[in-house]
Interface confidence: low
């Protein structure tokens, strides 16, 4: 029954790049500019996305395909299809509401974007520090402290609290 | 394409524990918090929490601080949100929504299909 | 926690109407406010971010403002795909709360 009804449909002959057009009979008119239908049988089509401001364009609208959006340098994409541009930090830095901030003594970042993370606690797997870390870096864990020579030390700071990335939207 | 499949509905009797899951495929589980949303019937919206999967840092709110429990299986990319001492009050829609790891600009963007959980004698 | 009032918890308009939706936050919450869009038995769907900000995909019609305080959705010309209800949230601070939601139907 299915089948029957979309053969009798004239707007299941309609191919992507076009619509339906109820204006003209249902023939299939050419998506206009600066749209797109990207399957068949479209009633309407769809109006291209556009790359403005901190958005550049990855990759051209067509009468077939949306256009893709990427963001600009010193800003990244988030979400999905790059919905967002975020600015970038240095690595040992975090984006709080007041700007790129330095990781707090104890935490690390070694990208341009996300959150500070505490540097590993090589104790809890009773192991020492082998090389500090820094704001850009996490430690290097080694032996344990039983294998190294008496009066090495094995101190890594406790984590700090750190402000959750959680942000909702 | 991105999805977060949550468990199916669960009825309970008051005083017992249940515990509901959200499955991630589709993206790096590990880069974007796991939020879980409360909404009982004909109610709004609350937020219960969230946790990082990377290192399964969370963050309550005071509220649920006794009731709920979050945790992940990375290996899985599942979430878990434990519910104890349930009391009919509980009854609820319960969602598993993700961001990503930037607190400030960060959006839901995308949302399981909610849990219903009943909790009657 | 940060309390959010919002106004009205419904109203009926006529389609084409613009609608406006506000919220109160209990303390400033500079413009870290969110705009949500609920339909009967579906998950919320998120519209606006950092007060004004739209979404991708989002259509035009919808629109923010406000910070501090007060914040307003608004919706330009109200369509038959609308009628939904309407939820803030405040994530300033932790926990995240959401306004109470209105409730908008058509006339």
């Known amino acids: 029954f299915e089948r029957t009804r979309s053969l009798q449909d004239p707007c299941s002959n309609c191919p992507a790049g076009t619509f339906c057009d109820n204006n003209r009979n249902q023939i299939c008119s050419p998506c206009p500019p600066n749209s797109f239908s990207s399957a068949g049988g479209q009633r309407t089509c769809d109006i291209c996305r556009q790359c403005k401001g901190v958005f550049r364009t990855r990759k051209e609208c067509s009468s077939t395909s949306n256009a893709e959006c990427d963001c600009t340098p010193g800003f990244h994409c988030l979400g999905a299809g790059c919905s967002m541009c975020e600015q970038d930090c240095k690595q040992g830095q975090e984006l709080t509401k007041k700007g790129c901030k330095d990781c707090c003594f104890g935490t690390f970042n070694d990208q341009k974007r996300g959150i500070c993370r505490p540097w590993t606690n090589c104790s809890l797997d009773g192991k020492s520090v082998l090389v500090n870390g820094t704001k850009e870096r996490d430690v290097v864990c080694g032996p344990s402290p039983a294998d190294l020579s008496p009066g090495a030390s094995s101190v890594t700071p406790p984590a700090p609290a750190r402000e959750p990335g959680h942000s909702p939207q | 394409q991105v999805q977060l499949v949550q468990s199916g509905a669960e009825v309970k009797k008051p005083g017992s524990s249940v515990k509901l899951s959200c499955k991630a495929s589709g993206y790096t589980f590990s880069s974007y918090w796991i939020n879980w949303v409360k909404q009982a019937p004909g109610q709004g919206l609350e937020w219960i929490g969230n946790?990082?999967?990377?290192?399964?840092?969370?963050n309550y709110n005071q509220k649920f601080k006794d009731k709920a429990t979050l945790t992940v299986d990375k290996s899985t990319s599942t979430a878990y949100m434990e519910l104890s001492s349930l009391r009919s009050e509980d009854t609820a829609v319960y969602y598993c929504?993700?961001?990503?790891?930037?607190?400030?600009?960060?959006?839901?963007?995308?949302w399981g299909q909610g849990t219903t959980l009943t909790v009657s004698s | 926690d940060i309390q959010m009032t919002q106004s009205p918890s419904s109203l009926s308009a006529s389609l084409g109407e613009r609608v406006t939706i506000t919220c109160k936050a209990s303390?400033?919450?500079?413009?870290?406010l969110s705009w949500f869009q609920q339909k009967p038995g579906k998950a919320p769907k998120t519209l606006i971010y950092?007060?004004?900000r739209l979404v991708d995909g989002v259509p035009s019609r919808f629109s923010g403002s406000g910070s501090g305080q007060d914040f307003t959705l608004t919706i330009s010309s109200l369509q038959p795909e609308d009628i939904a209800t309407y939820y803030c949230l405040q994530y300033d601070e932790l926990p995240p709360t959401f306004g109470g939601g209105t409730k908008v139907e058509i006339k």
């Open positions: 946790i990082y999967p990377s290192d399964s840092y969370t």
């Open positions: 950092r007060a004004n």
């Open positions: 303390q400033d919450i500079n413009s870290y």
């Open positions: 929504t993700r961001t990503w790891e930037f607190y400030y600009d960060s959006v839901f963007d995308y």
